[in-house]
């Protein structure tokens, strides 16, 4: 039974100086973990893995590494130009065994469409995944194989929300002892039956995924045969009982007033830090309206910014966020209207999110200019469009067949994005890059470990 | 390389008619999609018409139909846009263009285009 209760991952997540330059506050960056969090909580909380049920994750500690770090020498993630294996080893050379789990998050460009990756886990035997602890392998270095890493940049261009929670679920799902998923079974999006291909490939798919089909943020029934073994045998080694709130870890949770760290952390005047006692932590301090860690609309000074201050850009579908001088939260912000152009023309505002294909302004659905003889390489880059239903109908935005709505301009997709039936990305060239799944992984192998740990990392 | 070149444009009274051409510099055009477009001063270049390689098929804005016909000469590798009833709203610079064999090919060859200008 005290089995059943331990439920719960506890994670460390630090972020490098590039993610920081890219979210530009602590603040965002706090909230971009947060989000990454709760996104693979609801994803694994939801998934009966062979009996085991709620799943869920909890952030133990973060390190953000700001533009001040970038020359520190203790920063391990302080290098300009690392691939992303050295990158997934620099965070494996730490001691992560007070955690279930250890990730890096960071805004690099890493070669061929590459994501994360990260260590895989297997019931027995097993070096990498979940709760693994630090030992010394054949390199003669001491690694901590309960690790991942994962970006939001690919091909010069930042992916989407939606696919980086899906990135994070995926090298976390590898953690959790599944490899990538193949078979027909479990790669529907390869089907050349209509009905079951429109639903998409699921979380473990080897290659790209849009991240708003059916299927995309769902494990295969193969991730979960393995991932249930995996989690039968290894829970019990570091899993939690979950509820309580963890002071210290950045996030204002269920109990907590605030949240600014621990002391080496906390650069806040309105909150005690972690390391305060029992009564104090996580609580405002006497006379403060509020904390930064609560939300943008909080003054360094502790108090409510007034109703006019912005705390959210303008974007693509929604308008900027407004304080409204009573909360330190950003109220939500209005949308524009559906329809409205976004993400260079390729899509279009649904419900203030930049989600629906350009076709779809015009009754039509996005299909893949994939090609099967191989002819038409070139405009597997285009955005391309069909009549519901009919695949038959599918070619570019700058076809003959859809001139009345696109006047003869070929809409290129964003570089970063699926093309090719999902089986690549775009270049910056508008080149559609088959992504090699497992290439990383056996330079990784070659490099430094001996043949017993060779099946045990993966994108 | 083929070579476009629209001519036919000038300024046309409201109400008025004008017949545009485009001369294609290759015989291949004979069975390609032909189409024209056009961009007003500050607008986004807009569809016209096309027409198929045999003439068979052809497909109109909603702007213009009833108004203009598209119609080719192959033995003189020419496009033709017969424009009546004009409208102060139909001055702009007007493209023919070239796609491939399908209606689903992309228009790859563009003329340099001719003014047309619709006094009221």
């Known amino acids: 039974t005290t089995s059943a209760e331990k439920n719960t991952c506890q994670l460390y997540i630090q972020t490098d100086h590039l993610f920081f330059k890219y979210y530009g506050t602590r603040e965002a960056v706090i909230a971009q973990i947060s989000s990454h969090v709760k996104a693979i909580d609801t994803i694994y909380q939801t998934t009966d893995f062979s009996g085991i049920r709620n799943i869920s994750f909890m952030v133990k500690r973060i390190r953000i590494n700001t533009t001040a770090d970038e020359k520190d020498p203790t920063n391990p993630f302080r290098f300009p130009n690392i691939g992303v294996e050295k990158f997934l080893e620099l965070n494996s050379e730490q001691n992560h065994d007070d955690y279930c789990l250890a990730y890096v998050f960071t805004d690099r460009d890493f070669d061929d469409g590459v994501l994360g990756l990260a260590w895989v886990g297997a019931p027995s035997g097993s070096s990498g995944g979940i709760c693994e602890k630090s030992k010394l392998y054949s390199d003669g270095k001491k690694k901590s194989l309960n690790t991942g890493i994962i970006t939001v940049q690919n091909y010069g261009s930042h992916v989407p929300p939606k696919v980086s929670h899906i990135t994070f679920a995926h090298e976390v799902g590898h953690n959790f002892g599944s490899p990538h998923d193949s078979g027909t079974e479990c790669t529907p999006g390869e089907s050349k039956n209509l009905g079951q291909k429109e639903n998409g490939n699921y979380i473990m798919y080897a290659r790209a995924t849009s991240g708003d089909k059916l299927n995309n943020n769902k494990f295969s029934l193969c991730s979960i045969r393995n991932i249930s073994q995996v989690l039968e045998k290894k829970r019990n080694n570091c899993f939690v009982e979950s509820g309580q709130p963890i002071c210290g870890n950045g996030m204002v949770e269920q109990g907590e007033e605030c949240d600014c760290g621990y002391s080496d952390q906390c650069k806040d005047e309105c909150c005690f830090d972690a390391n305060q006692p029992e009564g104090r932590k996580c609580k405002l301090k006497p006379g403060k309206q509020c904390s930064p860690s609560q939300g943008p609309c909080c003054t360094a000074q502790c108090a409510f910014k007034s109703k006019s201050e912005k705390c959210r850009d303008d974007s693509d579908c929604a308008r900027e966020g407004i304080c409204n001088g009573f909360t330190a939260l950003c109220p939500a912000s209005d949308p524009k209207p559906n329809f409205t152009d976004c993400n260079r023309h390729t899509q279009v505002c649904i419900n203030g999110q930049c989600a629906g294909s350009i076709c779809e302004k015009y009754g039509l659905e996005e299909c893949t200019c994939a090609s099967s003889d191989g002819k038409d390489d070139k405009e597997l880059c285009h955005v391309c469009c069909m009549k519901k239903m009919d695949p038959s109908t599918c070619a570019s935005t700058g076809s003959v067949q859809w001139s009345r709505h696109f006047s003869g301009r070929t809409i290129t997709l964003q570089p970063g994005s699926p093309c090719n039936d999902f089986r690549g990305y775009c270049d910056v060239f508008m080149r559609c890059r088959l992504v090699d799944a497992d290439g990383p992984l056996a330079r990784l192998k070659k490099a430094i470990f001996s043949p017993e740990l060779y099946e045990n990392i993966a994108e | 390389e083929v070579q476009l070149v629209e001519s036919g444009g000038g300024l046309v009274q409201a109400g008025g008619s004008l017949r545009l051409s485009c001369a294609a510099s290759?015989?291949?055009?004979?069975?390609?999609?032909m189409g024209w477009f056009r961009q007003a001063p500050g607008k986004e270049r807009e569809f016209v018409a096309f027409i198929s390689g045999n003439g068979g098929s052809t497909d109109y804005a909603d702007s213009v139909k009833g108004r203009f016909a598209i119609s080719r000469d192959n033995v003189k590798n020419t496009l033709y846009l017969q424009m009546s009833s004009l409208k102060p709203d139909d001055t702009a610079v007007y493209y023919c263009?070239?796609?491939?064999?399908?209606?689903?090919?992309?228009?790859?060859?563009w003329g340099q285009g001719t003014q047309v200008t619709v006094s009221s």
């Open positions: 290759e015989r291949i055009f004979s069975t390609y999609f």
């Open positions: 263009a070239v796609a491939g064999r399908q209606i689903k090919s992309t228009w790859g060859y």
